[in-house]
Structures are given as structure tokens and as C-alpha cells.
């Protein structure tokens, strides 16, 4: 469930802090409820970038697990189509700390509406 997703995000945050990765990532910091699935997709795609750049097994496995969890939770809600949402590349670029904080925020949005 989404609580597991948040714990994975916390784990990724801890792992990244010890690695000093200074990438900037497309970050949706003001998610409109009607675009939350699209925003989630952008967060997950950017997480893959972190995983790729880190070359770290723990980060890789945690990111993969997070994607598997999110996939299963969202698939159980049926196919959700959203329109008029920003493309990932249109989002503001932020540092990893801000990116992860925004990610936790969107997950909490899913928790509150489930």
C-alpha cells in the first residue's frame, strides 16, 4: 500500500544522503488532484534516473520495488485517464531533497483520497 511507498522513499532519501548525488530532477510541487496520476508517473520516471545514476544496488532495488507497489495500487483502481496535465519536461527542476519531499506529498494525497 501507499504507506510502504513512503517507507521506500524514506529509505531512498537515507541512501542518497550518504552518496552526495547532485542531480536536478523534474518535480511537481503543486499537484492538482485531477493530475495526480500523471504527476506520479513523472516522479517514478525521475526515480529511475536517480537509480541509474547512483549505480547502487540498494537504491536500484528500492526504486524497482516502489514502482511495482505503485503499479499494483493504481491498477486496482482501474485505468485512470487524465488530460490537460503538464508533461514531465515542463516541470520545474529541483534538487533531490526537494524532489523526494514533493514525492512524499503526492503519495499522501493518494492516501487521503483512498
Amino acid at each position: 500500500n501507499w504507506v510502504n511507498v513512503i517507507s521506500d522513499l524514506k529509505k531512498i532519501e537515507d541512501l542518497i544522503q550518504s552518496m552526495h548525488i547532485d542531480a536536478t530532477l523534474y518535480t511537481e510541487s503543486d499537484v492538482h488532484p485531477s493530475c495526480k496520476v500523471t504527476a506520479m508517473k513523472c516522479f517514478l520516471l525521475e526515480l529511475q534516473v536517480i537509480s541509474h545514476e547512483s549505480g547502487d544496488t540498494d537504491i536500484h532495488d528500492t526504486v524497482e520495488n516502489l514502482i511495482i507497489l505503485a503499479n499494483n495500487i493504481l491498477s486496482s483502481n482501474g485505468n485512470i485517464t487524465e488530460s490537460g496535465c503538464k508533461e514531465c519536461e515542463e516541470l520545474e527542476e529541483k534538487n533531490i531533497k526537494e524532489f523526494l519531499q514533493s514525492f512524499v506529498h503526492i503519495v499522501q494525497m493518494f492516501i487521503n483520497t483512498s
Epitope: V37, K41, L44, D61, V63, I67, N71, N72, S75
Partner: antibody, heavy 122, light 112 residues
Framework: EVRLMASGGGLVQPGGSLRLSCAAS????????MSWVRQAPGKGLEWVAT????????YYPDSVKGRFTISRDNSKNTLYLQMNSLRAEDTAVYYC???????????????WGQGTLVTVSS | DVVMTQSPLSLPVTLGQPASISCRSS???????????LEWFQQRPGQSPRLLIY???NRFSGVPDRFSGSGSGTDFTLKISRVEAEDVGVYYC?????????FGQGTKLEIK
């Protein structure tokens, strides 16, 4: 050439336990997630378990959850499947398979071992 | 759970002729990141399964180019442009977009 050798199969009574092993060679074992897939005699394929590269994350279908445990020892290049509370319907050839990472663009079971037969019968 | 349904279950083909196998999923298997994790496996008699196609249409290394995959959403197809004797066996589609990962029932290809 990637090599996967499954072993440990045999005859076991219902309710019994068995541990399967899969020895990997000719590739960097710790860089790949791994899976077990089974095939009952004359039947189709059924996914049984998957484990992440480092071994922290495991995934199962409901049919084996709570009874089977997938694990790995990266220092020994070996994958395991601990099977408890075995039932007649667990009778099958068990294959181990290497899984390409989702993040590197694949997420497919690209190489398979030769399989080991598990028979559950009294 | 995602149910994968293959058709036909038996496929008699003349050597040199094309063959086509359909696989339909009970729901879309496009994942949250936009990927469709749909594979095709071949299992020759007495052998282990072998990966042919991954992510719908990508041919795995060493797989002859007479094999091709296509489809999207819930409908997928494996095509063999010209069947050869070594193609005899059972073909399975498989989705690993969503846990539990699931196989189709298999399609047995035989020579007429």
C-alpha cells in the same frame, strides 16, 4: 554463455518441505533479479517467486505466499526456493530464471535453467 | 489478477507458411511509467522455455527475425513469417507489469 543449474527436486510427502537451489555462472549474479517458474506435468507455466538483486524484496502469487520463500546468496552465486507445507498441486518442474532489470529497460526473464522435478505424493 | 488468454490453443501450420498467435489481457498492462511488460516464450518439446520477445515487440538476442511481436493495451500478437521445423513447440505470452505475474495457457504449434 549464461548458465543456470537447478537442483534439489525429488519425492516428498504432502505437508513436507524441500529446498531447491539454482547455481548461476558466466554472469554477474548480483546484478540481476531472479525468479522461479513452475510447470505441472503436461500443463502450462506458472510464475512462483521473484527476488530483487540484493535480496531485500520478494514477490509471490497467492498460491504459494506464506508457504514458499525465495532467497539468494550473492557470495555463492546461488538462488534458493524453500518450499514448506507442500501439496499435491505443487508437483511440477521448477525452473529458475534470470530477470533483466526494469530500470535498465528490460524486465524480462531472459535465461532459464533446465528445471528440477518436485513430486508431492504419499 | 490479470488473466492472459491465448488463441488458438492449437495451431497446425504448413512449413514455410506464416503463423499468428493472439494474446489478450483482462485489463490494460501498460504500467504507470508507460511501459508494457509483455513477453513471448517458446518451449520446444523436452526443453526449458526460451525468451523470444520482450516489451511487446523487442526481439531477444539470437532470435530469428521471422519472429515478431506487436500490440498494445490488452491485445497482443506473435507472428512467425515463415514456419520452420524447429519452431514446433508451445508458445506462451506473459505479463509482468502487475503482480502476480501471469502466463497465457500456451499455444501448441505443430506442422501439418
Amino acid at each position: 554463455e549464461v548458465r543456470l543449474m537447478a537442483s534439489g527436486g525429488g519425492l516428498v510427502q504432502p505437508g513436507g518441505s524441500l529446498r531447491l537451489s539454482c547455481a548461476a555462472s558466466e554472469f554477474t549474479f548480483s546484478n540481476y533479479a531472479m525468479s522461479w517458474v513452475r510447470q505441472a506435468p503436461g500443463k502450462g507455466l506458472e510464475w512462483v517467486a521473484t527476488i530483487s538483486r540484493g535480496g531485500d524484496y520478494t514477490y509471490y502469487p497467492d498460491s504459494v505466499k506464506g508457504r514458499f520463500t525465495i532467497s539468494r546468496d550473492n557470495s555463492k552465486n546461488t538462488l534458493y526456493l524453500q518450499m514448506n507445507s507442500l501439496r499435491a498441486e505443487d508437483t511440477a518442474v521448477y525452473y529458475c530464471a534470470r530477470r533483466v532489470s526494469m530500470i535498465t529497460g528490460g524486465w524480462a526473464m531472459d535465461y532459464w535453467g533446465q528445471g528440477t522435478l518436485v513430486t508431492v505424493s504419499s | 489478477d490479470v488473466v492472459m488468454t491465448q488463441s488458438p490453443l492449437s495451431l497446425p501450420v504448413t512449413l514455410g507458411q506464416p503463423a499468428s498467435i493472439s494474446c489478450r489481457s483482462s485489463q490494460s498492462i501498460v504500467d504507470i511509467t508507460g511501459n508494457t511488460y509483455l513477453e513471448w516464450f517458446q518451449q520446444r518439446p523436452g526443453q526449458s522455455p526460451r525468451l523470444l520477445i520482450y516489451k511487446v515487440f523487442n526481439r531477444f538476442s539470437g532470435v530469428p527475425d521471422r519472429f515478431s511481436g506487436s500490440g498494445s493495451g490488452t491485445d497482443f500478437t506473435l507472428k512467425i513469417s515463415r514456419v520452420e521445423a524447429e519452431d514446433v513447440g508451445v508458445y506462451y505470452c506473459f505479463q509482468d507489469s502487475f503482480v502476480p505475474y501471469t502466463f497465457g495457457q500456451g499455444t501448441k504449434l505443430e506442422i501439418k
